[in-house]
């Protein structure tokens, strides 16, 4: 039950995270014009990964796409790539994790196969989250670097445009969405990896071997005494004695001559 919950929660958290990464990638407000201490502005500039926009005081907004590919700064291209890789990995991870969900039955899929798929999707989510966090952080670093550049023709690196000294850019809403979304995807991935451990069969099942001792016939199932998770009865870790199913505690309570060699 706990494994199913962990897996389900990991899936939901990752789903929200990936939706956030997609939203952040599409958003126009990666960088917004620094308003200093003036909240009311006549012309407000903001820029995304794909286009730059201008909002006038009336609310009229005009956006222009970056129609060049070669003319864009390498850093912007790198951020785009990281975000797209994050989305692609996350989408594949979601697809894999749907089939890996314990609550969904697909044919006669073994638990080991589901465990592998859960681990795969978990790793994909982790990498996806890291890509998003890295992309947003690179962009944020670019903004911080450019913020203090106050030369007359300040090159901001957003779409290769020349800025006048009065237009400075600061963190836009998309950066915060990206950081949170990347973090959620990362957490979801970790949860999937944790769930994978619970899904995996605890030990390879060998055929039971019989050991015959005088006076007693004991069927011993190898595997040792692993720590119980505390959920359900731990039947795998019990020794079965002929003439009554006694637990390991009971055996220790009644020592026989065969316990001392």
């Amino acid at each position: 039950m706990a494994v199913t919950a962990c897996q389900g929660l990991g899936f939901v958290v990752s789903l929200i995270g990936i939706a956030g990464i997609i939203a952040a990638t599409c958003m126009d407000q990666w960088s917004t014009q620094d308003l200093y201490n003036n909240p009311v502005t006549a012309v407000f500039n903001y820029q995304g990964l794909w286009r730059s926009c201008v909002r006038e005081s009336s609310g009229f907004t005009e956006c222009r796409g970056y129609f060049t590919l070669l003319g864009l700064p390498a850093m912007l291209q790198a951020v785009r790539a990281l975000m797209i890789v994050g989305i692609v990995l996350g989408a594949i991870g979601l697809l894999v994790s749907i089939f890996a969900l314990k609550c969904i039955r697909i044919g006669s899929m073994e638990d080991s196969a589901k465990a592998n798929m859960t681990l795969t999707s978990g790793i994909m989510f982790i990498v996806s989250g890291l890509c998003a966090i890295a992309g947003v952080s690179v962009f944020a670093n670019m903004l911080v670097t450019n913020f203090w550049m106050s030369t007359a023709n300040m090159y901001t690196g957003m779409g290769g445009m020349v800025q006048t000294v009065q237009t400075r850019y600061t963190f836009g809403a998309a950066l915060f969405v990206g950081w949170v979304a990347g973090g959620l995807t990362l957490i979801g991935g970790v949860m999937m990896c944790i769930a994978c451990r619970g899904l995996a069969p605890e030990e390879t099942n060998y055929k039971a071997v019989s050991y015959h001792a005088s006076g007693h016939s004991v069927a011993y199932k190898p595997g040792g005494f692993k720590a119980s998770t505390g959920f359900g009865s731990n039947t795998k870790n019990k020794k079965i004695y002929d003439g009554g199913a006694r637990t390991e505690d009971e055996v220790q309570s009644y020592p026989s001559k065969h316990d001392y060699v």
């Epitope: 006549a42 012309v43 500039n45 926009c53 006038e56 005081s57 009336s58 005009e62 222009r64 006048t164």
Partner: antibody
Framework: EVQLQQSGTVLARPGTSVKMSCKAS????????MHWVKQRPGQGLEWIGA????????TYTQKFKGKARLTAVTSASTAYMELSSLTNEDSAVYYC????????????WGQGTSVTVSS | DIVMTQSPSSLTVTAGEKVTMSCKSS????????????LTWYQQKPGQPPKLLIY???TRESGVPDRFTGSGSGTDFTLTISSVQAEDLAVYSC?????????FGAGTKLELK
Amino acid sequence: EVQLQQSGTVLARPGTSVKMSCKASGYRFTSSWMHWVKQRPGQGLEWIGANYPGKSDTTYTQKFKGKARLTAVTSASTAYMELSSLTNEDSAVYYCARGAYYGNAMDYWGQGTSVTVSS
Amino acid sequence: DIVMTQSPSSLTVTAGEKVTMSCKSSQSLLNSGNQKNYLTWYQQKPGQPPKLLIYWASTRESGVPDRFTGSGSGTDFTLTISSVQAEDLAVYSCQNAYSYPFTFGAGTKLELK
């Protein structure tokens, strides 16, 4: 048709206050900025400030902070400007003008309210 | 604040003549985000409120005759009337529409000979 109807001529004593109105019609009052502009006889235009009735945003030029107070009553589609501590320098024609949707321009103007400050 | 300087302060012309007037701003009015110049031109006839002629430095307001042309970029702007008519006699003012507080030029008065 967009119309801005301003209140009539005002004669005031120095040190007093006046409140003029600008009644808007023919458009959604809450969706545009309302600008106020001063023009002294034989002189150029001087921007006082503007307010956005839909968001209660107001901005003034430094010179008129404390002198002019811009308000609006959305239910009546009317903008107001109150001028306090009047001096002879405040004698002018005051225009209200609607902020255009494009270019931060002022596309429709009221006929103006003439204020004369005299003792 | 951005200071707007207009020249000449007055112009005496004959009907049918081509007229140009200048407007200079103390700071660039070019917005890099959309490559538009936030400069507006108004016409004010005696005893009347101003009338919007041109916004974004070169875009004519609807209903404005095409003899009025706005040009320029950055800090230097020009209003040209290709063939002056009697009804064009007025004061022409330019306005910074780029940043608050909005500021106007002193105006150029167009008079007939």
